[in-house]
């Protein structure tokens, strides 16, 4: 009888074991284990009747198609074999064991005790057949195995071979190299590669196989395994295989498909080809006069580009448009995309206007072309070129006027300061005790009119100031302080300020320049109690044009000492000029007390100690600080007065030969202006030079050298 066994292990014993087995007995055990396993069989006890070639009693081990072993007896002889320590391994997952005893046994034989077990097959080691083994990597596990591929490869659906994904290769460059995957290593199996060369219409692709060409072939059948096919439109070239590369191929097309097929076997190195685009030839080119063509070639083909440029100082001119370079291209029909342009000399055109300056041409016919030269100069004597620049500009190759120092920036004409168009007389008669000023004597003098229209009725007052630049007026803070405040210092609104420059007679403002204020800046520390830091600035809405009657005064150097005692200074103003009119009379009578014509007076600086003493001796809280100085005469008779406030006290600087503002009319009193031993008190401007430059947004070095020279 037959016993079917399906367990992974088990025990088989002869009938009746451990007693002797019966005669004339036959049992077959069929052992089946899962795929991926084989069966290992061994005997722990074996005692059968001996016979020549095991003819009588035996144990036969076999598979479906082969006998693995036949055992009998109790020990091995030449003609009979016992299992002993031998292990029987089935090649597959099936093993059949047959026990047979004949009709007579001379002795008692105890039979056998056998054990079997399923053991794993290491397919990775044992498979030598290329058709079954893994292409790249093999991984064994209990009961089976699987294959995997190297990086960049994909396992084929046969779960054994490794292919590549190579069906999406697009080449658009005009030249290139295409190879089989992994070249020059053997190409992958089971792959379908597609390479597309897609160039612009007008190009023709030429192919050339290079180096190694090694594609699996067959001695009789043309390329049945692996091959290359080249598809040009509807036409197919190939298949190609073997070791001899095809001849160079001129496709006459801009679009080419290369198909490469490999089957699941073989070890061949593959192929490499280069492709090159060919196009129509364009006619020879001649460079323009004063120009060149790049790149310079003997021949030009479709898609070749040339850049036309001109010599230094010339510009490419195409259709009346100037440009630095011009590019033309060889078209697919073998013509150039454009005619060669011409080279035209660079023209810097009319130079920019210089504010407060003039232009003179150094080149004949007022030429403005490359290398022409011009010279800027300032409107002297009212303006001077900053940093003593030469003012010479040359027409550059870029088409801009260039100066060696300033580049393309225009020079700056700075107002000259402290140089009246009319020289001030050295002797001045005894705006109290003063005399009429001739027009142009004090070109920095400004009349500041403040009209506060925010109050009903309007508040209106005036003061003086000094022009520092085309845009800035220096004055006293108390002139520009809101008058309705008791102790707080608030500047008047800029809208309420009007500045008159070049004014001589207040009755005739027609010749004067009037300007509104863009900013009103009081010194942040101005003290209404003692008039300390009585200094302010007005920025004009627009810069004023300078001329004989409008010119700035110079600022002093930073000198804490201020002007030296007994130095003579001049001060001008439209204030009270009649020493016999008292303040009370002005108030009560309403008499017009402004002087029509600008008055000026020459006054000596009073030693600080003397001035302090003269004010300390009075009743009242008078304080002459280090930010003030005094001027006037002990005997009186000449002084500044009400309405002159903010005006410049100027001293002639011998070093620079210019007039410098050393003081601003600030305060005096309590007696009438011009009284005996009542000195006028002036803001010491030299203490505020840094503050002034800072507010004006100018570095001191810009203007300072004018005073120093």
């Amino acid at each position: 009888h037959t016993v079917e066994l399906n367990n992974m292990f088990g025990q088989i014993q002869s009938p009746g074991y451990p007693d002797s087995y019966p005669s004339d007995s036959e049992v077959t055990w069929n052992i089946t284990v899962p795929d991926g396993f084989r069966i290992k069989l061994y005997f722990m006890h074996f005692n059968l009747e001996s016979s020549y070639l095991c003819e009588y009693d035996y144990v036969k081990v076999e598979t479906e198609d082969q006998v693995l072993a036949t055992f009998c007896g109790r020990e091995t002889t030449d003609t009979e074999q016992t299992p002993g320590q031998e292990v029987v391994l089935s090649p597959g997952s099936f093993m059949s064991i047959t026990f047979r005893s004949d009709f007579s046994n001379e002795e008692r034989f105890t039979g056998f005790d056998a054990h079997y077990m399923a053991v794993d097959v290491d397919e990775c080691k044992e498979r030598e057949d290329e058709e079954l083994s893994c292409d790249h990597y093999c991984h064994n596990y209990i009961g089976g195995y699987y294959c995997s591929c190297r990086f960049g490869y994909i396992l084929h659906t046969d779960n054994r071979t490794c292919r590549v994904e190579c069906s999406d290769n697009l080449f658009t460059q005009r030249t290139g190299v295409i190879t089989s995957p992994d070249f020059p290593n053997p190409y992958p199996k089971s792959s379908e590669c597609l390479y597309t060369i897609e160039l612009e219409e007008g190009f023709m692709v030429n192919l050339q196989f290079e180096d190694i060409f090694d594609i699996e072939d067959h001695p009789e059948v043309p390329c049945p395994y692996d091959y290359i096919k080249i598809k040009v439109g509807p036409k197919v070239l190939g298949p190609f295989c073997g070791e001899k590369a095809p001849e160079p191929i001129s496709t006459q097309s801009h679009s080419v498909l290369i198909l490469f097929h490999s089957d699941n076997s073989g070890e061949n190195r593959g192929w490499r080809l280069s492709y090159r685009a060919a196009g129509n030839e364009c006619p020879e080119l001649q460079p323009p006069v004063h120009g060149k063509i790049e790149p310079s070639q003997a021949k030009y083909f479709f898609k070749d580009q040339v850049l036309v440029s001109c010599d230094t100082g010339y510009k490419v001119l195409k259709d009346n448009v100037e440009m630095d370079t011009f590019q033309i291209e060889c078209l697919k029909d073998g013509t150039w995309s454009n005619k060669i342009p011409t080279c035209k000399i660079v023209d810097c055109r009319a130079p920019g206007e210089l504010e407060h300056g003039l232009i003179t041409f150094s080149t004949r016919n007022n030429l403005t072309t490359y290398k022409s030269e011009i010279k800027y100069s300032c409107q002297e004597p009212y303006y001077k070129m900053l940093n003593n620049n030469t003012g010479i500009y040359t027409c550059s190759a870029q088409g801009v006027w260039m100066n060696k120092v300033l580049g393309r920036s225009l020079p700056t004409c700075l107002p000259e300061c402290g140089q009246p168009s009319r020289s001030l007389p050295s002797l001045v008669k005894r705006i109290i005790g003063g005399r009429n000023a001739e027009p142009g004597l004090f070109p920095w003098q400004a009349l500041i009119v403040v009209e506060d229209t925010s109050r009903v009725p309007n508040d209106k007052w005036f003061g003086s100031g000094a022009l520092l630049s085309a845009s800035w007026i220096l004055t006293a803070a108390h002139v520009l302080r809101s008058q309705r405040r008791d102790t707080t210092v608030i500047p008047v609104s800029k809208e309420h300020v009007t500045v008159y420059l070049g004014l001589h007679d207040v009755r005739d403002k027609s010749g004067a320049v009037n300007s509104s204020a863009a900013r009103v800046v009081l010194h942040p520390d101005f003290n209404i109690q003692n008039y300390n830091h009585d200094i302010a600035l007005v920025q004009l809405q627009e810069p004023v044009p300078l001329g004989p009657h409008v010119m700035p005064v110079c600022l002093p150097r930073l000198e804490p000492e201020g002007p030296a005692p007994h130095m003579l200074g001049l001060v001008a103003g439209w204030g009270i000029s009649n020493p016999n009119v008292t303040v009370d009379e002005i108030i009560s009578s309403g008499t017009r007390t402004l002087s029509d014509v600008l008055q000026y007076v020459k006054l000596p600086v009073v030693p600080h100690a003397e001035c302090k003493t003269s004010y300390e001796s009075r009743s009242g809280n008078y304080s002459v600080t280090e930010n003030m100085f005094c001027a006037g005469y002990y005997e009186g008779g000449k002084d500044t007065c009400l309405g002159d406030s903010g005006g410049a006290f100027v001293i002639f600087d011998d070093l620079s030969q210019r007039w410098v503002v050393q003081g601003l009319v600030s305060w005096g009193g309590p007696e009438e202006c011009g009284s005996k031993q009542v000195y006028g008190v002036y803001t010491k401007v030299s203490n505020y030079v840094d503050w002034v430059w800072e507010q004006m947004g100018l570095p001191q070095s810009v203007v300072e050298p004018q005073v120093e020279r």
Partner: antibody, heavy 113, light 112 residues
Framework: EVQLQQSGAELVKPGASVKISCKAS????????IEWVKQRPGHGLEWIGE????????DYNERFKDKATFTADTSSNTAYMQLTSLTPDDSATYYC??????WGSGTTLTVSS | DIVLTQSPSSLAVSAGEKVTMTCKSS????????????LAWFQQKPGQSPKLLIY???TRESGVPDRFTGSGSGTDFTLTISSVQAEDLAVYYC????????FGGGTKLEIK
Amino acid sequence: EVQLQQSGAELVKPGASVKISCKASGYTFTGKWIEWVKQRPGHGLEWIGEILPGSGSTDYNERFKDKATFTADTSSNTAYMQLTSLTPDDSATYYCVRSEDLWGSGTTLTVSS
Amino acid sequence: DIVLTQSPSSLAVSAGEKVTMTCKSSQNLFNSRTRKNYLAWFQQKPGQSPKLLIYWASTRESGVPDRFTGSGSGTDFTLTISSVQAEDLAVYYCKQSYIPFTFGGGTKLEIK
């Protein structure tokens, strides 16, 4: 015609706030100061402060700094005074004045529980 | 703050009489820059808003009868009504215009 038109009388409870308006017409509202003046029955005039509508600049009498707030709406030519934390002492007639010369008709405020 | 003291606090006169009232300031109200005294006089008739009569101590507001005259400078100021009319019955206030502005206590004018 140049005039200042004030909002009507107000009766409010102590602790509340009130906003009095003053609409200007006939002149450039932004360019002139608007003053506010308090008058209690049988008392004199007290200057509360002022606002320049164009710039929003304000000046306050120290006594009213925590009581009154001035604002101005230039699109409607209207000045406002808000009074907060009202007490019976705030009961009065409040005038708006165009920089001394032109007075509004006054707004009477009564603070009572 | 500047304090203004008005006197008398009230007075009664017959129509046609001349009236003088004063206003004293605790500080000088003359501004040397504008050459103005920042003092104004106002008239408040019963049940009405105050009305500007005089500004800058002595300048009469347009439309104000010339019987009203302001004078003075510095700290002492006077309002004079040369010939009182019945319609002049009112309280008269002085006001100084340095911030913070302040008013005097008022002078009440009654007609006999």
